[in-house]
């Protein structure tokens, strides 16, 4: 079965800079899975942001600002990366990755 690890326990960024969050997949080939990213703001319910499927298709939640989030995966390191552009107060949250095994 697949296993996920987010090596960065926390990430501190200056306003307007770019943040990159990593999710390392083990126990399964990343190319055979879909990786989902969610965020949980303080005091709010968890919210789906973006996913990248086994065939590379990216799906974004409607209502999420365009250009704010980018998702990628690197088969060589079995890693999915969530990039957050122009970091703002509204982006302060705990970010989770999740796996869907095809």
């Amino acid at each position: 079965a697949g296993h996920l690890e987010q090596p960065q326990i926390s990430s501190t960024k200056t306003l307007s800079k770019t943040a990159r969050l990593e999710c390392v997949v083990s126990g399964i080939t990343i190319s055979a899975t879909s990786v989902y990213w969610y965020r949980e703001r303080p005091g709010e319910v968890i919210q789906f942001l973006v996913s990248i499927s086994y065939d590379g298709t990216v799906r974004k939640e409607s209502g999420i600002p365009s250009g704010k989030f980018e998702v990628d995966r690197i088969p060589e390191t079995s890693t999915s990366t969530l990039t957050i552009h122009n970091v703002e107060k509204q982006d302060i949250a705990t970010y989770y990755c999740a796996l869907w095994e095809v």
Epitope: L15, S16, R41, P42, G43, E44, P65, G67, K68, N86, E88, K89, Q90, I92
Partner: antibody
Framework: EVQLVESGGGLVKPGGSLRLSCAAS????????MNWVRQAPGKGLEWVSS????????FYADSVKGRFTISRDNAKNSLLLQMNSLRAEDTAVYHC???????????????????WGQGTMVTVSS | DIVMTQSPGTLSLSPGERATLSCRAS???????LAWYQQKPGQAPRLLIY???SRATGIPDRFSGSGSGTDFTLTISRLEPEDYAVYYC??????????FGRGTKLEIK
């Protein structure tokens, strides 16, 4: 001195347009979320719109959605509110207000409008 | 949308007395997103309390905030002459982001 100064108010006929401006000084404008809040004569406060520091997140009250547009120019320390299709019920003093910003303590994510302008009066009447 | 209900509408108290103002939300509000303001005639509002219980810069310690969930309270321990004003609670949420209560007018008895 931290300051917000609104301008652009005035008398306009129903269906008309106005553009409000808010000039910010005394702080790093690009680091703060900004808001417009209005107050009709003798009434309470009504939040109108907000815009995040890099303009990614923009929200409107249902009462103005589709008619008002908020924007900002971080290079000019300026907040704008374009108001179209104005109605009599839009008559109010319009304040711009700054959100608390990001602190480095445990309350870093708390919200609250900590700096307000004195407001500009908008009157919609035929 | 979350509706914020403030009570009482008007509160008449004498200087030196304790004032207790209530704010009730129509659904749960994280204390992170609850603020209180004071407004005097002809002036812009002033932030008193954010995060339900944290005093804003320069606010005297006779002002305190408490509460969680749907019930929040602003307390003024000993009323001073300059405290007579209208007080508003406000929540930050996701749809729409900000909503204010209708206010409590604190007047001299």
């Amino acid at each position: 001195e931290v300051q917000l100064v609104e301008s652009g108010g005035g008398l306009v006929k129903p269906g008309g347009s106005l553009r409000l401006s808010c000039a910010a000084s005394g702080f790093t404008f690009s680091h703060y979320d900004m808001n417009w809040v209005r107050q009709a004569p003798g009434k309470g406060l009504e939040w109108v719109s907000s815009i995040s520091s890099s303009s990614s997140y923009i929200f409107y009250a249902d009462s103005v959605k589709g008619r008002f547009t908020i924007s900002r120019d971080n290079a000019k320390n300026s907040l704008l509110l374009q108001m179209n299709s104005l109605r009599a019920e839009d008559t109010a003093v319009y304040h711009c207000a700054r959100d608390r910003g990001v602190g480095d303590t445990s309350d870093y994510y708390s919200f609250g409008l900590d700096v307000w302008g004195q407001g500009t009066m908008v009157t919609v009447s035929s | 949308d979350i509706v914020m209900t403030q009570s009482p509408g008007t509160l008449s108290l004498s200087p030196g007395e304790r004032a207790t103002l209530s704010c009730r939300a129509s659904q749960n509000v994280s204390s992170t997103y609850l603020a209180w303001y004071q407004q005097k005639p002809g002036q812009a509002p002033r932030l008193l309390i954010y995060g339900a219980c944290s005093r804003a810069t320069g606010i005297p310690d006779r002002f305190s905030g408490s509460g969680s969930g749907t019930d929040f309270t602003l307390t003024i321990s000993r009323l001073e002459p300059e405290d007579y004003a209208v007080y508003y609670c406000q929540q930050y949420g996701s749809s729409p982001p900000y909503t204010f209560g209708r206010g409590t007018k604190l007047e001299i008895k």
